[in-house]
């Protein structure tokens, strides 16, 4: 996470340091596009993989085991087989070029129309290339050629099912349908706090307004991601830290524009598993009333 050395609130009467908000949003978009994008665009497949990894690609079955005898095994959302992929229509409406912020790709036609923020759902999406998906500020990650190719992604047959335990009043088992195997984790550089500048030769990418540096690292295979592979894991930011890292005051109510600046960081934090502690599978080792999910708010 970029850290600021500046005092934030005194300089902006609105309670937001817009320069910092834009730069931080771009940083998180860059992280996400590095993991799931290719050539500065997010394909439908990459978008699906992102949704899959943050756990919202399909309905999942949750078993809740309560401590009390009279509440045994409740099943919620048993229709976990039903995929929601059919909801994602060609991605035009997901990343049209109107909203706001951050980082944007433009297609090779030279139309430099890139969207900028997180919720992309409003104007002027006709005729847009569905790859115009980086929000305001999402910019070319430096290891563009090192991005995982959709073709290299982990196939369903290679994926196993994993159970995450969250122990609190009751034990909640979230049964995920597709999760990474130990052998399919990303290298340690996936989510480093501030990616180093790459000084290798620049080339013009097929997206009109971006230059992409040749990668100095091996291409990563597969979209599956776990922050446990990271020697420098991303911190789990609570509400206050998310706000201050974007140059926003913690006492001031957020409007929609300001909330939009936070969206990439929120998604990135979920995707990087920043707020999950992976505990032993042996229940006996889990002390009562402990949490494998850090309290983030």
């Amino acid at each position: 996470f970029p850290q600021t050395t500046e005092k934030i609130s005194p300089n902006w009467e609105s309670g937001i340091n817009v320069d910092l908000a834009i730069s931080t949003r771009q940083y998180h978009l860059q992280q996400l596009f590095y993991r799931y994008g290719e050539n500065n665009s997010l394909s439908v497949e990459g978008f699906r993989k992102l949704l899959q990894n943050i756990g919202i690609d399909k309905i999942k079955r949750i078993h809740i085991h309560h401590d009390h005898d009279h509440h045994s095994d409740h099943e919620h959302h048993s229709d976990h087989e039903r995929h929601s992929d059919h909801e994602h229509h060609s991605e035009h409406e997901h990343h049209s070029d109107h909203d706001h912020h951050s980082h944007h790709n433009h297609a090779a036609s030279g139309k430099n129309k890139r969207k900028a923020l997180c919720p992309d759902h409003d104007s002027d999406s006709s005729g847009k290339d569905p790859r115009n998906s980086q929000g305001k500020g999402a910019h070319r990650p430096e290891h563009a050629s090192g991005r995982r190719n959709v073709k290299d992604s982990v196939s369903a047959s290679e994926v196993t099912s994993t159970v995450y335990n969250t122990v609190s009043e009751g034990t909640h088992f979230l049964e995920t349908i597709e999760t990474p195997r130990p052998g399919k984790l990303f290298p340690k550089d996936v989510s480093s706090s501030t990616p180093p500048s790459v000084t290798s030769k620049s080339r013009v990418s097929r997206l009109a307004g971006r230059k992409t540096n040749e990668s100095v690292s091996e291409p990563r295979k597969g979209f599956m991601y776990s922050r446990n592979t990271n020697e420098n894991p991303q911190e789990c930011f609570n509400a206050s830290k998310l706000l201050t890292s974007h140059g926003m005051g913690i006492q001031v109510p957020l409007n929609a524009t300001e909330f939009n600046y936070l969206c990439p960081a929120i998604i990135n934090q979920i995707d990087a598993r920043s707020c999950l502690i992976h505990t032993s599978e042996k229940k006996a080792e889990i002390p009562p009333k402990t949490y494998s999910l850090q309290i983030a708010w």
């Epitope: 050395t5 910092l20 109107h98 912020h101 923020l117 500048s197």
Partner: antibody
Framework: QVQLKQSGPGLVQPSQSLSITCTVS????????VHWVRQSPGKGLEWLGV???????DYNAAFISRLSISKDNSKSQVFFKMNSLQANDTAIYYC???????WGQGTLVTVSA | DIVMTQSQKFMSTSVGDRVSVTCKAS??????VVWYQQKPGQSPKALIH???YRYSGVPDRFTGSGSGTDFTLTISNVQSEDLAEYFC?????????FGGGTKLEIK
């Protein structure tokens, strides 16, 4: 105190390159992106490009073939290079920290033989 | 690219008056607009960001409004030091683009 100070030549020969260094203080290049803008009487203010915290860059498509922005975080310096300048590239070139009041003092560049 | 149009190149006003400078975007830019003031021989100085939020140190006689495609910078109780050129800029989509400027002249 946030400051951006520019240094570079004022006169460039046609077809030659322009190099400007922007040295920042009061903030870190690992926290903020730095943008480049130019201003000319004929074309007004034009956004040229940006280098972000991780070293990634975005360029105005109109300049991508001849523009390069890089930086040295440890020295708090951002480097701007534009190739193949012509007379219509005569302008004041600014570095700036995003859409804020923090701009460099500007470098007046005249392209002339 | 998004075109930011400031239809009035020059505006004439008197000290104490109220004046409004307008800017129109060629497509929706939400509230991602900055207003700059530039005095001769100086770098632009940002007055307003996010269409309506004043930067600190900017007198409260400067107010910004608008969203989507239509934006206004209003200067109430104009002072002689407000003689300058005013630019709008959108930072919603790349490339960021500027309006052509409106020069404020004091009668």
């Amino acid at each position: 105190q946030v400051q951006l100070k520019q240094s570079g030549p004022g006169l460039v020969q046609p077809s030659q390159s322009l190099s400007i260094t922007c040295t920042v203080s009061g903030f870190s290049l690992t926290t903020y992106g730095v943008h480049w803008v130019r201003q000319s009487p004929g074309k007004g203010l034009e956004w040229l490009g940006v280098i972000w915290t991780g070293g990634t860059t975005d360029y105005n498509a109109a300049f991508i073939s001849r523009l390069s922005i890089s930086k040295d975080n440890s020295k708090s310096q951002v480097f701007f290079k534009m190739n193949s300048l012509q007379a219509n590239d005569t302008a004041i070139y600014y570095c700036a920290r995003g859409p804020s009041s923090y701009w460099g003092q500007g470098t007046l560049v005249t392209v002339s033989a | 690219d998004i075109v930011m149009t400031q239809s009035q190149k020059f505006m004439s006003t008197s000290v104490g008056d109220r004046v409004s400078v307008t800017c129109k975007a060629s497509q929706n830019v939400d509230t991602n607009v900055v207003w700059y003031q530039q005095k001769p021989g100086q770098s632009p100085k940002a007055l307003i960001h996010s269409a309506s939020y004043r930067y600190s140190g900017v007198p409260d006689r400067f107010t910004g409004s608008g969203s989507g495609t239509d934006f206004t910078l209003t200067i109430s109780n104009v002072q002689s030091e407000d003689l300058a050129e005013y630019f709008c800029q959108q930072y919603n989509n790349y490339p960021w683009t500027f309006g052509g400027g409106t020069k404020l002249e004091i009668k």
